[in-house]
Interface confidence: low
């Protein structure tokens, strides 16, 4: 994850990162929209693999809480926003079915617009 | 991914997502910096699994293509950046040592700032 | 030894709420999902509900033909999974099972003996 | 929804007869995931199978299921008195469902 700030450059959304296991997990929600569990290990070729990712999200605690960092705000409403993508992990779906699927993870904190209307 | 755009509302960076798969990407970075083979397919208990990826961008066509939207251009100068996360994914590294590990791949489009100086 | 009791069932006017509890004992009561099962006098078996154990997060899911009027929940504290039944209906009219589901799949190692539901004005 | 219509209805049979109960999905189903049941008059049912071939703990080996797809199967080599009940199976493929049972009775 490339750090702006070592470049003297600010985000305009504040972001945390973290590990974060299937333990903690526990339940994620695949492409279809339906809610799967999340299976602790992964059988591989030498025993089990703890499953674990890599999640971002908008910093609760941070400056842009209120709104995004730098925005002219004559014209433009603004907020910080988790954003997902989809990553691969061995689930367990309502029917307890066993396979791989994608499931969505929090990515990024990425700042959203809306246009102010005239007073 | 939910669709900003939906809620009437606009990204301060555009951004483009796809599928990618491993065919496409033939190399990554793994965490500790070296370049890794990422493998056409995965083993799993009944055959073998395609292994792809969905990936986030910046827009390179996009109207934020020379800055980011909504700023404040009076004090800051911004740029959208194309920021990477780690997902898991069965490797090859150049010792040819088959295993998961953790490559970086691109996730989101976010706007970076870096202040004016005074003229 | 797996010993599942149901208890809640009685004779309700349609339109009434019922709640019925099973109580759970000789296995890890928090790990494990179940589900209910009804039997209508002289009739066969439907699957009406489940929830899942710790490990799921106590999800929980229904059949179709009740999703509106049933709500499944545990108590894993109490070792107790409850089904409350609201609206009840003349077709409610059975015997409710608690079963304990197996690891592997919605399938029923272990049954309770059940708790006879009437629904009759 | 995956209906399950078992078939005969009833059986009537001897001790010591060889009892076959059918049970037919409306779809084939995956993997095989098809249990069997008996219940007893005014007792819980009790798994017998499941995977369609697979004993569960405790089940006499008298007992034995098979079949895949649409097609199930479960087999008394040679029944018991105490094997005289209703069968149900059931699929768990889809959201659980059961067949209709059969009897089976003492002829």
């Known amino acids: 994850h490339s750090d702006p700030a070592r470049r003297g450059e600010l985000s305009v959304c504040d972001s945390i990162s973290e590990w974060v296991t299937a333990a903690d997990k526990k339940t994620a929600v695949d492409m279809s929209g339906g809610t799967v569990t999340v299976l602790e290990k992964v059988p591989v070729s030498k025993g089990q693999l703890k499953q674990y990712f890599y999640e971002t999200k908008c910093n609760p605690m941070g400056y842009t809480k209120e709104g995004c960092r730098g925005i002219d705000k004559r014209h433009w409403n603004s907020q910080c926003r988790t954003t997902q993508s989809y990553v691969r992990a061995l689930t367990m779906d309502s029917k307890k079915r066993i396979g791989w699927r994608f499931i969505r993870i929090d990515t990024s904190c990425v700042c959203t617009l809306t246009i102010k209307r005239g007073r | 991914h939910s669709d900003p755009a939906r809620r009437g509302e606009l990204s301060v960076c555009d951004s483009i997502s796809e599928w990618v798969t491993a065919a496409d990407k033939k190399t990554a970075v793994d965490m500790s910096g070296g370049t890794v083979t990422v493998l056409e397919k995965v083993p799993v208990s009944k055959g073998q699994l395609k292994q792809y990826f969905y990936e986030t961008k910046c827009n390179p066509m996009g109207y934020t293509k020379e800055g980011c939207r909504g700023i404040d251009k009076r004090h800051w100068n911004s740029q959208c950046r194309t920021t990477q996360s780690y997902v898991r994914a069965l490797t090859m590294d150049s010792k040819k040592r088959i295993g998961w590990r953790f490559i970086r791949i691109d996730t989101s489009c976010v706007c970076t700032l870096t202040i004016k100086r005074g003229r | 030894d797996v010993q599942l009791v149901e208890s809640g069932g009685g004779v309700v006017r349609p339109g009434e709420s019922l709640r019925l509890s099973c109580a759970a004992s000789g296995f890890t009561f928090s790990m494990y999902d179940m589900s209910w099962v009804r039997q209508a006098p002289g009739e066969g078996l439907e699957w009406v509900s489940g929830?899942?154990?710790?490990?799921?997060?106590?999800?929980?899911y229904y059949a179709d033909s009740v999703k509106d009027r049933f709500t499944v929940s545990r108590d894993n504290s109490k070792n107790t999974p409850y089904l409350q039944i609201d609206s009840l209906r003349a077709e409610d009219t059975a015997v409710y099972y608690c079963?304990?589901?197996?690891?592997?799949?919605?399938?029923?190692?272990?049954w309770g003996l059940g708790t006879l539901v009437t629904v009759s004005s | 929804e995956i209906v399950l219509t078992q078939s005969p209805g009833t059986l009537s049979l001897s001790p010591g007869e060889r009892a076959t109960l059918n049970c037919r999905a409306s779809r084939s189903i995956g993997s095989s995931y098809l249990a069997w049941y008996q219940q007893k008059p005014g007792q819980a049912p009790r798994l017998l199978i499941y995977d369609a071939s697979t004993r569960a703990a405790g089940i006499p080996a008298r007992f034995s299921g098979s079949g895949s797809g649409t097609e199930f199967t479960l087999t008394i080599s040679s029944l018991q008195s105490e094997d005289f009940a209703v069968y149900y199976c059931q699929q768990y493929d889809d959201w659980p469902s059961f067949g209709g049972g059969t009897k089976v009775e003492i002829k």
């Open positions: 079963a304990k589901e197996n690891n592997r799949s919605i399938f029923f190692d272990y």
């Open positions: 929830i899942r154990g710790s490990a799921g997060d106590a999800v929980t």
